[in-house]
């Protein structure tokens, strides 16, 4: 269960892959596309609103939790739309929905090396958001082999890595980026 109904914090960040391709969104009222693509220099990067929640349930992987709590996120590219896992189709979808959000919209946030994160489905432990054929997809990860698999690694490029360390709390986190002082937007919600 998610602790509380309000996020503990929120931030706007552009999402890119381990190989620095950008995740971009094209939404209309009744249709959408999610692209994984190289952007031109003048193209403004799409941002997603990450809302951070504490969960009492550990995921299938240990290490990122604090006192048995896991950090979960929802990802929203615009008002009223959220990324959701479709476990049957192994797909990542955009849905317009109202709060409270369904479990499919929640992802356990894991901190990885090189300032990367990964997103594990709350509804299907061991399954992560990943990149397949220039699209987002759900990818099953064999923990014994593919923990560092590049296709499930993402960069939150406009979040200060120190902020990431603070909210994720991974003990082995290292700030390898001298440009860590990127400005980020986040709002604390007091319960």
């Amino acid at each position: 269960s998610i602790t509380g109904i309000s996020p503990i914090t929120e931030s706007l960040a552009s999402l890119s892959t381990y190989n620095d391709q950008s995740i971009t969104f094209a939404l209309e009222d009744e249709s959408y596309e999610i692209y994984v693509e190289d952007l031109k220099k003048d193209k403004k990067k799409d941002k997603v609103l990450l809302s951070y929640y504490e969960s009492q349930h550990p995921s299938s992987e240990s290490g990122d939790g604090v006192d048995g709590k896991m950090l979960m996120v929802t990802l929203s590219p615009t008002k009223d739309f959220w990324l959701q896992a479709n476990n049957k189709e192994h797909s990542v979808e955009l849905h317009k929905c109202e709060k409270p959000l369904p479990d499919q919209a929640f992802f356990v946030l894991h901190n990885r090396s090189f300032n990367c994160v990964s997103f594990e489905c709350k509804t299907d432990p061991g399954v992560f958001i990943g990149v397949k054929d220039n699209h987002l997809a759900l990818i099953k990860v064999d923990y014994s082999e593919n923990l560092g698999s590049e296709n499930i690694l993402f960069k939150l490029s406009e979040i200060n890595p120190a902020f990431l360390y603070k909210v994720v709390g991974a003990a082995d986190y290292k700030d390898d980026d001298d440009k860590a002082a990127h400005h980020h937007h986040h709002h604390h919600h007091h319960h």
């Epitope: 969104f25 939404l27 209309e28 009222d29 031109k40 003048d42 799409d46 615009t78 739309f81």
Partner: antibody
Framework: EVQLLESGGGLVQPGGSLRLSCAAS????????MSWVRQAPGKGLEWVSA????????YYADSVKGRFTISRDNSKNTLYLQMNSLRAEDTAVYYC????????WGGGLRYPFGYWGQGTMVTVSS | LPVLTQPPSVSVSPGQKASITCSGE??????AAWYQQKPGQSPILVIY???KRPSGIPERFSGSNSGNTATLTISGTQDMDEADYYC?????????FGGGTKVTVL
Amino acid sequence: EVQLLESGGGLVQPGGSLRLSCAASGFTFSSYAMSWVRQAPGKGLEWVSAISGSGGSTYYADSVKGRFTISRDNSKNTLYLQMNSLRAEDTAVYYCARDLWIQLWGGGLRYPFGYWGQGTMVTVSS
Amino acid sequence: LPVLTQPPSVSVSPGQKASITCSGERMGDKYAAWYQQKPGQSPILVIYQDTKRPSGIPERFSGSNSGNTATLTISGTQDMDEADYYCQVWDSSTGVFGGGTKVTVL
């Protein structure tokens, strides 16, 4: 079906004012940035002004800055263009246009004009 | 702001290829859109993000953009393609259109 219907055009004297409206239907109006684009008789297209989905951000071409004001009423699904201190060179067909896609966090103007109204004629002449 | 330069007119025989250029400084660094406008009608988006076609636009319309020039190509031009065509980019939250090109199908 997306529909944009402009109104409010007409004949006005130089220095006068006019308010154009664009009634939108068939989509979630407040989710999209909207623009006004004009076309003088026998000439090309000229972008005039744009406004974010919420109405919180507005943008203007240098040629109309300080004279024109763009606004929107999301409860009425209507876009407006208040035109003051009109000049002869403002004579044109004025189109309202909707962004192709919903505006994302971070805003800004970057999408093409996916849908256009039929236009309303504004003539500035004495 | 960039100045987008288009040829005033292009003539093409039915079934042949028509190419319309749109030149501007560092054009290839921006995303170009193209609009078709027939006499007495509103413009229609035919190409966006340099190469993408909206639904309902025939496959004979294609686009490219590199260096200082974006190009709209109509392969197998038909009589119904006779119209004015405008390129457009965003530059610092300002919309910029090219001067337009009249395509005549001979």
